[in-house]
Amino acid sequence: QKSSIEKCSVDIQQSRNKTTERPGLLNCPIYWQQLREKCLLFSHTVNPWNNSLADCSTKESSLLLIRDKDELIHTQNLIRDKAILFWIGLNFSLSEKNWKWINGSFLNSNDLEIRGDAKENSCISISQTSVYSEYCSTEIRWICQKELTPVRNKVYPDS
């Protein structure tokens, strides 16, 4: 089969570029999945943890933060492939010798049952069924999140 070499037409404004959005998000943007009061975006390539963290920021989002076991289960239910691992926003802080979320808070030991060691250069990944400690240099997929702004009913003073 003889193929001609063609040039590709590609989007001028790539979706990886930062976009300006109004503060406060009422609905999930296109391509994002809503999970309760969050919007999630699953990557289609692989990266070490640091690169994943940086790539989420280009989408004006962060690596996934998981509040509790319930949210973990709901997130895992969105994962369709059994053997695939995803980085989330949790890594081991050597100075504090504890698991630390990227928002600065520490892991409540009851929230996630982590398989693997808590040690230097360890980051947390999740699969369809489990939570793992992996070397942060491991190249796997990742999940970004944006918080939805809750819509509150406006209260008007009596006139």
Epitope: K7, Y31, V46, N47
Partner: antibody, heavy 120, light 107 residues
């Protein structure tokens, strides 16, 4: 202008290996994940795996996991796909294809294809 | 593995007529569906992503629709350059799979 140019046709014997190259131009090579897709004669398309040219990280279709190796040389903006222990049913056109977005699985640019014939 | 089934295998259409191509997924894939066009001796060319979003430079006569398991590519008025093979692909799972293709030929 974005372009992917692949190496020429190959004829191999069963059991041998083949290495196909894909040279990218017109964009930042390390900014987009490269995938490999093959098409057997008169058949549909089959996804083989991907490589992140920035880091060298790979993910392979389980079907090819034991036989395929994807690498890259960032200094010459080139991705490679090597398939070992070739069989007659590996006869196909092999395409490199650029992932258009880190968060969606579509291919917005394809190489012209490399025909690999496996015959004794 | 998600199986993508395209029908018909061959579609004979006259220039200027409408062509409707079908793609069915064996499981729900949401809207994570792509359509490509392939001409003889050429690589596939991206037409539509996310079931209905036309790629840059793709004429408005190409439109995609559907969600879940049933998807359609419509070419509203076939031009001579549209006679080709069309493939659908899903990326709802990380094992990307393609349909077997629909050949659109001149009637």
């Amino acid at each position: 202008q974005v372009q992917l140019v692949q190496s020429g046709a190959e004829v191999k014997k069963p059991g041998a290996s083949v290495k196909v190259s894909c040279k990218a131009s017109g964009y930042s090579f390390t900014g987009y994940t490269m995938n490999w897709v093959r098409q057997a004669p008169g058949q549909g398309l089959e996804w083989m795996g991907l490589i992140n040219p920035n880091t060298g990280g790979t993910y392979y279709n389980q079907k090819f996991k034991d036989r395929v190796t994807m690498t890259r040389d960032t200094s010459i903006s080139t991705a490679y796909m090597e398939l070992s222990r070739l069989r007659s049913d590996d006869t196909a056109v092999y395409y490199c294809a650029r992932l258009g977005d880190n968060y969606r699985g579509y291919f917005d640019c394809w190489g012209q294809g490399t025909t690999v014939t496996v015959s004794s | 593995e998600i199986v993508m089934t395209q029908s018909p295998a061959t579609l004979s259409v006259s220039p200027g007529e409408r062509a409707t191509l079908s793609c069915k997924a064996s499981q729900d894939v949401g809207t994570a569906v792509v359509w490509y066009q392939q001409k003889p001796g050429q690589a596939p060319r991206l037409l539509i992503d996310w079931a209905s979003i036309r790629h840059t430079g793709i004429p408005a006569r190409f439109s995609g629709s559907g969600s879940g398991t049933e998807f359609t590519l419509t070419i509203s008025s076939l031009q001579s350059e549209d006679f080709a093979v069309y493939y659908c692909q899903q990326y709802s799972t990380y094992l990307y799979t393609f349909g077997g293709g629909t050949k659109v030929e001149i009637k």
